[in-house]
């Protein structure tokens, strides 16, 4: 386990040419804050992709409001290191995203907006233990710099953080098949670190971070049984040498968590939800005190200052779990509401709003009907974001203020001409057709599909529809 | 313990202003939403305005609109509703209430007892 | 504005009683629907979150279920300090708006 720690330096126009305008102004105040996400190897995943190694999110800047006339100048920074702690081996090779956000501070509906300044990326190579590496990058017209190192925390030591010194239990030498620990020469290598949930029963390790299964037993975490008795599938006969592998099992019966542990499935295995004052794959670890830092994800301990009172976690936001070991998809919660998308920056919550909602949440609805008259008579009508006016006769546009046309659809048939009346509108049929909107042929003989004309008026006149 | 302790309410007449205060302990002021809600004599609850963590932003119910204004002062871990113009209907119990963290699902988790508006000539 | 309505508007119950009351929004809230009770002292506590998330200490007697526009809050078996008046307010879209109140009194 370790941290991965960012100090970002400046940030502000590049050299050369085309000095980027200041992203604040006296009537948008602004301030800066920093994102970064890890990602393990030297692939190059899309920005969207998961930040495997971790996230984290910087505390906003001082308020900047720009000098009028002035260039832009590197802008104020937020104070303190990004910290994203891994709880595995550090894998060597990394990928980087450092993304620059402005929060502004107006008085805008739905209160600060952010927007996207700036993203650099990047694939290192990086030794844990080393000294800072600085860095330059350069996005657009703007210039970023910083500097990272990756650390472990103890009692975890390497380049990888995955070889564990403890002190010497005796005075002249470590235990066997164990060496002293350089440069500490006064403590000892403690076993290796298995992958992370390997099953301390029924898997072992040779090399950090792998896990191997005892006989019986498989899955990645051996954790899973395999029957060995010969049996017959529903697809036949297995061809596994060591008889076959059958449903057997679920990984929670007879409940592997110990001490009051309850059990969940997983898709590869089981997992544990366990009491306070316990912890651990199964639960199985006890007597724990804050001073074995039990909270993992930066969540602060309370209590607990001896083996027989237990402690409590209190999270911070974005984990969850007694141990704040599970990360919250915040996002599954569906917060932004009337369609909004989600987006979980590591620390905050943001939610990008569909036309006619604002709010931090997506909650207001501003094209509803509150406060919002239709003329003319017109009456309101909303739903789903977007609110409409269904007007009176004679009238259209958005909020009816406009004078419609009535002929504008065309509503004379069979090639009558229409004419706008003050009182609606006038069709002059063509010969052989009648009605109101031309639309009954008059038949040779002169009597007429029904409805009959009004007495008194003939096939051809105008007929007024009111 | 969550605790949200309302003051300044008493009888005021139409036309007139109060400044409710919210005076709020147990929790990390600065990291949630608060509201108002109040309920008139015999009658259900009514939300009635809500100011964001950071105060950069707030709402308000459209009959009080123009006329309250909500405030927090996160350094005195205090809310405040300045009450202009009142009027007879605004007569009621107002409680402040804590928004939910990050403001997820709206709710008003902890509130107040309440202070007791009365507007009357 | 989203109108709130629920029902009953009262209802007795005795101790024991398996109590539902219902709450109707005038269009669909995705769920963001939350559930007080509030007792006669005036003090207003939440109880149901996001329909059917139970607040910290609220007794597990308490349920909530829906989605839409309709929506249930159901007391499995009510309990002598369950008598009290219970409100549905929807947290989807401002303003944020109250049913009308459910008072649930001893029969």
């Known amino acids: 386990a370790g941290v991965f720690e960012l100090q970002i330096h400046s940030f502000g126009p590049g050299p050369g040419p085309g000095a980027p305008r200041s992203p604040c102004s006296a009537r948008l105040p602004c301030r800066l804050f920093f994102r970064v996400c890890l990602k393990p190897g030297l692939s190059e995943e899309a920005a969207e992709s998961p930040c495997a190694l971790g996230a984290a999110l910087s505390a906003r800047g001082p308020v900047y409001t720009e000098q009028p006339g002035a260039p832009a100048p590197d802008l104020p920074l937020p104070d303190g290191l990004l910290q994203v702690p891994f709880r595995d081996a550090w894998p060597g090779t990394f990928s980087f995203i450092i993304e620059t956000w402005r929060e502004e501070l107006g008085d805008q509906i739905g209160g600060p907006a952010w927007s996207l300044l700036a993203r650099v990326a990047g694939r290192r190579r990086l030794a844990a233990g080393g000294p800072w590496a600085r860095d330059i990058q350069r996005a657009g017209a703007w210039e970023l710099r910083f500097s990272y190192r990756a650390r472990c925390e103890p009692p975890a030591v390497g380049t990888a953080c995955t070889r564990l010194c403890r002190p010497r239990s005796a005075p002249s030498r470590c235990g066997p098949g164990l060496r002293p620990c350089a440069p500490l020469e006064d403590e000892c290598e403690a076993p290796l670190v298995c992958r992370a949930g390997c099953s301390p029963e029924h898997g072992f390790c040779e090399q950090p971070g792998e896990c191997r299964c005892l006989e019986g037993w498989t899955g990645p975490l051996c954790t899973v049984p395999v029957s060995t008795s010969s049996c017959l599938s529903p697809r036949g006969p297995s061809s596994a040498t060591t008889g076959c592998l059958v449903p057997g099992p679920g990984p929670c019966d007879g409940n592997p968590c110990a001490n009051g542990g309850s059990c969940s499935e997983t898709p590869r295995s089981f997992e544990c939800t366990c009491p306070r004052g316990f912890y651990g794959l199964r639960c199985e670890v006890s007597g724990v005190t804050c001073a074995d830092g039990p909270c993992f994800n930066g969540g602060l301990c309370v209590g607990g200052a001896d083996p027989d009172s237990a402690y409590i976690c209190h999270c911070p936001p974005g984990f969850q779990g007694s141990n704040c070991e599970k990360r919250v998809d915040r996002c599954s919660l569906q917060p932004c509401r009337n369609g909004g998308l989600c987006l979980d920056l590591g620390h905050a919550l943001r939610c990008r709003c569909r036309a006619g909602f604002a709010g931090p949440r997506c909650e207001h609805d501003l094209d509803d009907c509150a406060g919002r008259a239709c003329a003319n008579g017109g009456t309101c009508v909303e739903g789903g974001g977007a609110h409409r006016c269904s007007c009176a006769l004679g009238f259209g546009g958005r909020d009816c203020r406009e004078r419609a046309d009535p002929c504008a659809a065309r509503p004379c048939a069979h090639g009558g001409r229409c004419y706008a009346h003050f009182s609606g509108l006038v069709c002059a049929c063509a010969p052989g057709y009648m009605g109101a909107r031309c639309e009954f042929p008059v038949h040779p003989d002169g009597a007429s599909a029904l409805p009959a004309a009004p007495p008194g008026l003939r096939p051809g006149d105008p007929q007024r529809y009111l | 313990e969550v605790q949200l302790v309302e003051s300044g309410g008493g009888l005021v007449q139409p036309g007139g202003s109060l400044r409710l205060s919210c005076a709020a302990s147990g929790f990390t002021f600065s990291d949630y939403g608060i509201h108002w809600v109040r309920q008139a004599p015999g009658k259900g609850l009514e939300w009635v305005a809500y100011i964001s963590s950071g105060g950069y932003t707030s709402y308000y119910a459209d009959t009080v609109k123009g006329r309250f204004t909500i405030s927090r002062d996160n350094a005195k871990n205090s809310l405040y509703l300045q009450m202009n113009s009142l009027r007879a209907e605004d007569t009621a119990v107002y409680y402040c209430?804590?928004?939910?963290?990050?403001?997820?699902?709206?709710?008003?988790?902890?509130w107040g007892q309440g202070t007791t508006v009365t507007v009357s000539s | 504005d989203i109108q709130m309505t629920q029902s009953p508007s009262s209802l007795s119950a005795s101790v024991g009683d398996r109590v539902t009351i219902t709450c109707r929004a005038s269009?669909?809230?995705?769920?963001?629907l939350n559930w007080y009770q509030q007792k006669p002292g005036g003090a207003v506590k939440l109880l149901i979150y996001y329909t059917s998330r139970l607040h910290s200490g609220v007794p597990s007697r308490f349920s909530g279920s829906g989605s839409g526009t309709d929506y249930t809050l159901t007391i499995s078996s009510l309990q002598p300090e369950d008598f009290a008046t219970y409100y549905c307010q929807q947290g989807n879209t401002l303003p944020w708006t109250f049913g009308g109140g459910t008072k649930v009194e001893i029969k």
């Open positions: 209430a804590r928004g939910d963290y990050e403001d997820i699902f709206y709710t008003m988790d902890y």
């Open positions: 269009r669909d809230i995705t769920k963001f």
